[in-house]
Amino acid sequence: LQDPCSNCPAGTFCDNNRNQICSPCPPNSFSSAGGQRTCDICRQCKGVFRTRKECSSTSNAECDCTPGFHCLGAGCSMCEQDCKQGQELTKKGCKDCCFGTFNDQKRGICRPWTNCSLDGKSVLVNGTKERDVVCGPSPADLSPGASSVTPPAPAREPGHSPQ
């Protein structure tokens, strides 16, 4: 014998209290597959979370983070504070990248500038807190007759480490 509940489509549930007829999911609940005996409560985008996609009778709500935060975790289960470019997030909040490191995003950690000399190249444009260095051709390639390159930005004082 076929289970009568198997005929209940997504967006409904098989209601045991009403001779296993297919009843629509109540408000704020959903069933994403057929043959369900209950509908699930929708995820609630509350507090730091805001609704990206409303719940429907056949699909769950989707959340993202309020401005100033970005999603972490599966399905945006957490929100992490944004920082400015040139900063990284620490336990005590946003901190400027130390000299010799950069971050060109609002999230993530400060990363060391590229070491151009490892590739036998010269620094074409100095790095900043927000941008990596730009490596140019190797010093040997810069013959006296070669076309000029963009002058590097003024370097910061060695050892300067803003906090």
Epitope: T38, D40, I41, C42, R43, Q44, K46, G47, V48, T66, P67, G68, F69, L72, G73, A74, G75, S77, M78, C79, E80, Q81, L89, T90, K91, K92, G93
Partner: antibody, heavy 123, light 106 residues
Framework: EVQLVESGGGLVQPGGSLRLSCAAS??????????VGWIRQAPGKCLEWLAL???????YYSPSLKSRLTISRDNSKNTLYLQLNSLRAEDTAVYYC???????????????WGQGTLVTVSS | DIQLTQSPSSLSASVGDRVTITCRAS??????LAWYQQKPGKAPKLLIY???NLETGVPSRFSGSGSGTDFTLTISSLQPEDFATYYC????????FGCGTKVEIK
Amino acid sequence: EVQLVESGGGLVQPGGSLRLSCAASGFSLSTGGVGVGWIRQAPGKCLEWLALIDWADDKYYSPSLKSRLTISRDNSKNTLYLQLNSLRAEDTAVYYCARGGSDTVIGDWFAYWGQGTLVTVSS
Amino acid sequence: DIQLTQSPSSLSASVGDRVTITCRASQSIGSYLAWYQQKPGKAPKLLIYDASNLETGVPSRFSGSGSGTDFTLTISSLQPEDFATYYCQQGYYLWTFGCGTKVEIK
């Protein structure tokens, strides 16, 4: 350092009301993303979430207690409040104030708790 | 409402034991689950958030796993200071707590 200090507990008559306070320090109740709520624990019983208010002043209540609860805050005093009306013996509990999320990652958990304030409902 | 059922409600264990506590949700809640430790007369202390993330300062012998409806808190090697009551809490829809698992000395 984040600190939450509850006050306002004590002996209350059945049918009466109480207003609990939670003084917050080390963060602002109006900082984006922050939510602060109330959780209680009757003697020897489970933890029960009651209410939460977020930085945008959105309020959330336990469905079973919604009609008797009011959560509010005073940003100038950085203080959270809970009003509970029509008190019954079963409202006797330690009432905790707790902040949602951790330091830089915020979600639906409570990383910081006050020490609690005991409310006894008895005639 | 979403209910959380913890098991066992209490257990006896010895120092050095591996302890596992389970929390079952009445429906799928993704990874929106936290674990707390509470000692008598004290406020709960957050151990694990988002099912498996260890809160800063919590010893690495504590770990959390699971998603959907079934979650586990594991203490890999029980220490004297770990005898306490442990609670799970969901934040998928409003907030609810399990009723606790008391870990006692055998």
